[in-house]
Amino acid sequence: QDVRVQVLPEVRGQLGGTVELPCHLLPPVPGLYISLVTWQRPDAPANHQNVAAFHPKMGPSFPSPKPGSERLSFVSAKQSTGQDTEAELQDATLALHGLTVEDEGNYTCEFATFPKGSVRGMTWLRVIAKPKNQAEAQKVTFSQDPTTVALCISKEGRPPARISWLSSLDWEAKETQVSGTLAGTVTVTSRFTLVPSGRADGVTVTCKVEHESFEEPALIPVTLSVRYPPEVSISGYDDNWYLGRTDATLSCDVRSNPEPTGYDWSTTSGTFPTSAVAQGSQLVIHAVDSLFNTTFVCTVTNAVGMGRAEQVIFVRETPNTAGAGATGG
């Protein structure tokens, strides 16, 4: 009956953690004697190829300084404890502690048997590092040039994490990779870039980080913050201002970041009706007269700059009953 070595083609282990490289001789055959078990790294330099051996009488040996005896152990293999007990070498699973990047590579598990001879199996050990992720908005001021408005950083991953963005805005991403502080790891930074305008302020975009150590992608929401000058509109004019009307009000509606620091009401004619009283963002009209046949201007200031809006007013002789109740900006 033929025997075979059962190994996993690939084993993944966390950087700094412990990994087991399974190795079993199958099937159990009466009279098949395992005289030695060895683990080798065929791709390593000659003096580091022999990783571990298990001799039925002498037990385990770990000759190479890398990984070294302090980081290696046989999980189940047992040497003969006396003349009356057999060694148990069918399970040659090797544990590797404190994984480093240098541990990555091919490992060959070999059973020297009698009378079948030598049989072996090979496992590829991959060392991975779970990255730490963070995303944050960059406080930017509106401009005509593309600017980084958000950063997503995946620190010290192995292999490098894949970063993408989910957003309905018109954007592009710029990615950089640098070596992490832990040897063999990579820190990936993705810059979410767009032409910053008020339309982007307060919008939530999502950084998506994918890595083989994650069960599912990491999704990190980021609320953009764009400083921009006031975007102004005027509401309250309903196209039904008539002489003597007393309940009219104009409102200066503003979107801005940061908040407005001042409102200024004026007219394009330069004449400001005395019955119109500015109260911050509102213009309260006590009684409409013919001086209101003008264009009102609301000018709003914030730390970034200013914005303005105009509203043309047409004063009627009598109320317009056809469109009464309609309001418009």
Epitope: G31, Y33, Q83, E110, F114, P115, G117, S118
Partner: antibody, heavy 116, light 107 residues
């Protein structure tokens, strides 16, 4: 303590047979293969074959398969190697040995001289 | 069968010398090689197993190296008690085969 004690010196005529014994003690006899290795005077070592006392399975070097018979008697913990059709080329020290990783335990050797 | 060609067959050296014995396998045997020391009138004793692993109680002046088809036993500083014959053996493939031996003489 593991011990393998072999039978004494044999002087044989060409064409005859010799049967060498190896009595084992200090371990479970049925759990390990007993191997036979010979060494002609001033020459190297040559593996003849082995027996597994647990099920009497045997395994031979093809060179000796037609002439060698390796057996084991569990009741006495003794292994035997019989070699037939002897010639002067078979004059050698014959060792029984127990494989524990390597050939770690050896009998003291049995000198077989084939001469007319 | 795998042929193990050992050289030299005879070696004469002085105490303190560094000496090497080589063994060449006729086909790849991995690291499945043992080195034995046989003193006159005694059975062989294991020095090295799996090509480079020193057996329990063997002085560290004995080292083994090699893999595949080429193997070396080195004695870093020869001692008078090293007077013996040295054999390599492969256990990669049945039947086990031995080198023809190297007789070491102390000058």
């Amino acid at each position: 303590e593991v011990q393998l004690v072999q039978s004494g010196t044999e002087l044989k005529k060409p064409g005859s047979s010799v049967k060498v014994s190896c009595k084992a003690s200090g371990y479970i006899f049925t759990s390990y293969w007993i191997h036979w290795v010979r060494q002609p005077p001033g020459k190297g070592l040559e593996w003849i074959g082995a027996v597994y006392p647990g099920n009497s399975d045997s395994n031979y070097n093809q060179k000796f398969k037609a002439r060698a018979t390796i057996t084991a008697v569990t009741s006495t913990s003794t292994a035997y190697m019989e070699l037939s059709s002897l010639t002067s080329e078979d004059s050698a020290v014959y060792y029984c040995t127990k494989l524990v990783g390597t050939f770690d335990y050896w009998g003291q050797g049995t000198t077989v001289t084939v001469s007319s | 069968d795998i042929v193990m060609t050992q050289s030299p067959s005879f070696l004469s050296a002085s105490v303190g010398d560094r000496v090497s014995v080589t063994c060449k396998a006729s086909q790849n045997v991995g690291i499945n090689v043992v080195w034995y020391q046989q003193r006159a009138g005694q059975p062989p004793k294991t020095l090295i197993y799996s090509a480079s692993y020193r057996y329990s109680g063997v002085p560290d002046r004995f080292t083994g190296s090699g893999s595949g088809t080429d193997f070396t036993l080195t004695i870093s500083s020869l001692q008078s008690e090293d007077l013996a014959e040295y054999f390599c053996q492969q256990y990669n493939t049945n039947p086990f085969t031995f080198g023809q031996g190297t007789k070491l003489e102390i000058k």
